[in-house]
Structure formats: C-alpha cells, structure tokens
C-alpha cells in the first residue's frame, strides 16, 4: 500500500531571464528512493540515480542545474518554459510517486511564488 505524500512547490511564477528552483519532497513513507526523474510534459530533463548520481539531458545541459538536494534549478528562463513539470520518485517497495509543479514565466517583474500543496 502506498502511504507516501509528495509535497511540491506548487504553482509558481518567475521572471523571464531569471531562475527558479523546482522542489519535491516525499514523506510519510519508509520506502527508499532509488531514482528521481524530472520531466517537462513528455521530455526528460534530469535524473538523479542512487548509483550514478545526476544526469542532465543534453538538450538542457546549459540551462538546468542539479539541486539543491533532489530538486532542480532552471536558469535563463524563457516564456517557452511555461508549463507543467513533474518529479517522479521511484521507490522500493511502494513503486512510483509523482508530483506536479506548474511554472509560469512572466515578461513583467511581477512574479510571486505560489503556496505549497500536497499530492497523495
């Protein structure tokens, strides 16, 4: 039975040209995490693997930095970065947990972080 909860940074906004940290936390389970995938729509951005460490997809190498922790930092944001991002936690023995973050990249300087929310 999957008892865990993913807490994410929720709906967030950031300025064009700036950077943003995407963060997910898995809690309420003693399942052990073996890998975390970060995806944008159907594109793989990065993987943090227990054995191999971080791997950033080649097409995102210049604009994506690993961390902090299991999070992901997006840099040099463009309006095209607006959209859904997913953290996918591969765990044993529970299986897969997925968290969703919606990022809006704004042209203006009015960019505020949304509240955190939880996905069971």
């Amino acid at each position: 039975m999957m008892t865990g909860t993913i807490e994410t940074t929720g709906n967030i906004s950031a300025e064009k040209g700036g950077s943003i940290i995407l963060q997910c936390h898995l809690s309420s389970t003693t399942a052990q995490v073996t890998q975390v995938n970060w995806e944008q729509q159907d594109q793989l951005l990065a993987i943090c693997n227990a054995d191999l460490g971080w791997h950033i997809s080649p097409s995102f190498k210049d604009r994506v930095a690993p961390g902090p922790g299991l999070g992901l930092t997006l840099q040099s944001l463009t309006v095209n970065d607006t959209g859904e991002y997913f953290c996918i936690y591969h765990t044993y023995p529970d299986g897969t947990y997925t968290g969703r973050i919606f990022l809006e990249v704004l042209e203006s300087s009015v960019a505020e972080h949304g509240a955190r929310f939880q996905i069971p």
Epitope: E7, S27, T30, V33, T34, Q35, V36, D51, G69
Partner: antibody
Framework: EVQLVESGGGLVQPGGSLRLSCAAS????????MSWVRQAPGKGLEWVAY????????YYPDTVKGRFTISRDNAKNSLYLQMNSLRAEDTAVYYC????????????WGQGTTVTVSS | DIQMTQSPSSLSASVGDRVTITCKSS????????????LAWYQQKPGKAPKLLIY???TRESGVPSRFSGSGSGTDFTLTISSLQPEDFAVYYC?????????FGGGTKVEIK
C-alpha cells in the same frame, strides 16, 4: 576536509534528557542526509535516527521511537539529537554520520560522544 | 527487520594472510530495479569511529586499498582482505541499507595470531 564533531554527551539519570549536537564542516551540509548511530560499550553498531537533507523526513527504529528526536539547522551546519526518557540501555557512544542522497550507507562519521545513563 | 549475521565473530591471522569474512542477511538485499545490492562494509579500530570500506556490496570507497574487496549478492556476502597488513587488525561490520530500520552485523574482530 569533511569533519563531523559531536558534543553534548555526559552522565544522566534514568528518565532524564540529553541533547546531542554535531557540527559539520568541509562539505555542503544541506546537500546530505544525516543519521545518528550508536555503539553500546563492547557491542556492535545500531542506527538510531535519520533526517533528510532538508529536514522534512525523519525515521527511527522502534527502540527509540517516541523518545528520540532528530533535527538539523542547515544555516548553522548542525545536526541534533534530543533524547528523552533515557534508559540504562541507551548508554553508548553516539556518532553522527553523513549519507549521500539516495544512498543510505554512512560515508563519513564523527568521532562520537559518550552518553551514560545511570543512577 | 532484516537480521545481519556475520561469521566468524573473531579470527586470528598473520600479516600476509588472506582473510575472508562472511555476512548473511535474513532477506535479499538486491533491488531488482537497479540490480544493486544495498550492503556496505565498515572497519573500526579501537576507540575510533567506523570507516566506510565498501558499498553496493562490491564498490570500494575512494582511498581504500585494493587489497579490500567485496562480493556476493542477494543474501550472502563476503569481505576479503587479500594480504593482511598490520593496520588491518580491527573490527569489521556489514550493514544493510535496503530497508528501514538499517541494521548492522554483529562484527568480526580480526586479531594478530
């Protein structure tokens, strides 16, 4: 150079409390999970508490659950273990130990601090 | 909880000897998803903190001499010291990090013959 320095050990009566500290240096403390591991006199090693890098997850074995609380202050590069309702069987050297994210072995250990529970 | 059983509990050996320590777990430490065995080996000298030697059952930690090697899979694991050196006399522990609570073997004390 990675350094973990424990403090706060001492003699305490059964039922008493003690707070251990671990000062970390030489690495990005907030990027690592941390644990406390203890060793009773002449005995083996026992893991007693775990905290994730950001402090949002904590785990304990049944032997200490409800009595021990692990916490951390990433701004101060410090790890803590609050021990309440202490028993004679909690007498041990307590080590803080570092863990790489997604890896749950202990890659660096402090030198330990001794806790003695006795009347 | 996963029980870790080490044998022997102690052994006497001479410098240059090949030493083998075994560790058995009460359930498999192999994750099928990544084919990794979640087992580590540590060395502890008197009055000192444990030191990581081996992780993933067979990967030597950086700076650990090549005479130390780990092998095994599933429930049966071995730590081998190919040619015992004076500084190797210590207590050795295996640890499973497959499932909570993480548990250690009882230790193997390697003494001078």
């Amino acid at each position: 150079e990675v350094q973990l320095v424990e403090s706060g050990g001492g003699l305490v009566q059964p039922g008493g409390s003690l707070r251990l500290s671990c000062a970390a240096s030489g690495f990005a403390f907030s990027d690592y999970d941390m644990s406390w591991v203890r060793q009773a006199p002449g005995k083996g090693l026992e893991w007693v508490a775990y905290i994730s890098d950001g402090g949002y997850n904590t785990y304990y074995p049944d032997t200490v659950k409800g009595r021990f609380t692990i916490s951390r202050d990433n701004a101060k590069n410090s790890l803590y273990l609050q021990m309440n309702s202490l028993r004679a069987e909690d007498t041990a050297v307590y080590y803080c130990a570092r863990q790489i994210l997604l890896r749950y072995y202990f890659d660096y250990w402090g030198q330990g601090t001794t806790v003695t529970v006795s009347s | 909880d996963i029980q870790m059983t080490q044998s022997p509990s102690s052994l006497s050996a001479s410098v240059g000897d090949r030493v083998t320590i075994t560790c058995k777990s009460s359930q498999s430490l192999l994750y099928s998803s990544n084919q990794k065995n979640y087992l580590a080996w540590y060395q502890q000298k008197p009055g000192k903190a444990p030191k990581l030697l081996i992780y993933w059952a067979s990967t030597r930690e950086s700076g650990v001499p090549s005479r130390f090697s780990g092998s095994g899979s599933g429930t049966d694991f071995t730590l081998t010291i190919s040619s015992l050196q004076p500084e190797d006399f210590a207590v050795y522990y295996c640890q499973q990090y497959h499932s909570y609570p993480w548990t250690f073997g009882g230790g193997t004390k390697v003494e001078i013959k």
